[in-house]
């Protein structure tokens, strides 16, 4: 089907919408995946909680978002700022990074173009 | 190499049409989105329009939605732009360009661009 | 008048550095990736930086990018004769479902 898109949500509309959703399920699935389940992270109580439930978890939160790229974009830049400060080296930001944008197609949404992740202002 | 030639610019009057043309070579034309950028004499760059590799999404500036339709013919590996309505202030050079763009994580870059060509609309 | 915001003009003497910023919003710079052109007279822009910090083959380490919440910096080092042009950021904006260029720096080698 061809079509010419519209407006993609302004951005107010989509902050909140990052602010209303809960992401730290999102936060915690992430983690685990790149610690390992690891029990030395026990920032979060995530120990008693499979990383699939979490994932689970963190898709229906996204799925009560506008299912636009923009609204993907800001809360995927959301949880990058999150845990910016958790992410001990250039190596855990790396694969935090590669995680978070492989978690739009987990939750079967389409990842989003033109979303720049770095937005730590270079602190990740 | 990769080449990109407009075509189709010249001289028209306010309220009347053109049709550009951009010829692509050297590349695998159906792969990337193109874009079209102007410039008004002594001016600056403006972004034009966006067309996605299979035609299937397309951006317009505001101030020519509606009146400027962009498209491709990946077959023929081309590019143009049908511009209606024409008014003084759409007087530019007219450059096609490839956009790097690609499907997730990546921004709109211009990393080939035609010489251009001019259109001016004047009574 | 732009919605990217960079200085009109800057200048510097040859072998100097230079710095050319670009000014957006949350909507474009801070969410998007930003690319550079410089536009030598007479001639079609060629793309310097893309995605922030990276440099297509054949442009010379001497220029930069980088970006920090809604601003975006062009740097230019061994300032040469030949880098005189006019430089232009560009980004997408999320709220216009657009590319915006900002108006453009003319550099000046002294």
């Known amino acids: 089907m061809r079509r010419e898109r519209g407006r993609q949500g302004d951005s107010s509309s989509c902050e909140r919408q990052v602010d209303r959703v809960n992401l730290k399920p999102c936060e915690q699935h992430i983690m685990q995946r790149i610690m390992g389940e690891q029990e030395q992270y026990d920032s979060y109580d995530i120990r008693s909680t499979r990383s699939s439930d979490q994932q689970q978890r963190c898709c229906d939160e996204l799925n009560e978002m506008e299912n636009t790229q923009r609204c993907m974009c800001e809360a995927l830049q959301q949880i990058m700022e999150n845990q910016c400060d958790r992410l001990q080296d250039r190596q855990m930001v790396q694969q935090f990074k590669r995680e978070l944008m492989n978690l739009p197609q987990q939750c079967n949404f389409r990842a989003p173009q033109r979303c720049d992740l770095d937005v730590s202002g270079g602190r990740c | 190499e990769v080449q990109l030639v407009e075509s189709g610019g010249g001289l028209v009057q306010p309220g009347g049409s053109l049709r550009l043309s951009c010829a692509a070579s050297?590349?695998?034309?159906?792969?990337?989105?193109m874009t079209w950028v102007r410039q008004a004499p002594g001016k600056g760059l403006e972004w034009v329009a966006n067309i996605k590799q299979d035609g299937s999404e397309k951006d317009y500036l505001d101030s020519v939605r509606g009146r400027f339709t962009i498209s491709r013919d990946n077959a023929k590996n081309s590019l143009y732009l049908q511009m209606n309505s024409l008014r003084a202030e759409d007087t530019a050079v007219y450059y096609c360009?490839?956009?790097?763009?690609?499907?997730?994580?990546?921004?709109?870059?211009?990393?080939?661009w035609g010489q251009g060509t001019l259109v001016t609309v004047s009574s | 008048q732009s919605v990217l915001t960079q200085p009109p003009s800057v200048s510097a003497a040859p072998g100097q550095k230079v710095t050319i910023s670009c000014s957006g919003t949350?909507?474009?710079?801070?969410?998007?990736?930003v690319s550079w052109y410089q536009q030598l007279p007479g001639t079609a822009p060629k793309l310097l930086i893309f995605?922030?910090?990276k440099r297509p083959s054949g442009i010379p380490d001497r220029f930069s990018g980088s970006k920090s919440g809604s601003s975006a910096t062009l740097g230019i080092t061994g300032l040469q004769t030949g880098d005189e042009a006019d430089y232009f950021c560009?980004?997408?904006?999320?709220?216009?479902?657009?590319?915006?260029f900002g108006g453009g720096t003319k550099l000046t080698v002294l």
């Open positions: 360009t490839r956009n790097g763009l690609q499907d997730s994580y990546s921004g709109d870059f211009f990393d080939h």
């Open positions: 050297g590349f695998k034309f159906s792969t990337f989105y």
């Open positions: 949350g909507s474009n710079i801070g969410h998007n990736y």
């Open positions: 995605d922030n910090t």
């Open positions: 560009a980004t997408w904006d999320a709220d216009l479902s657009a590319v915006l």
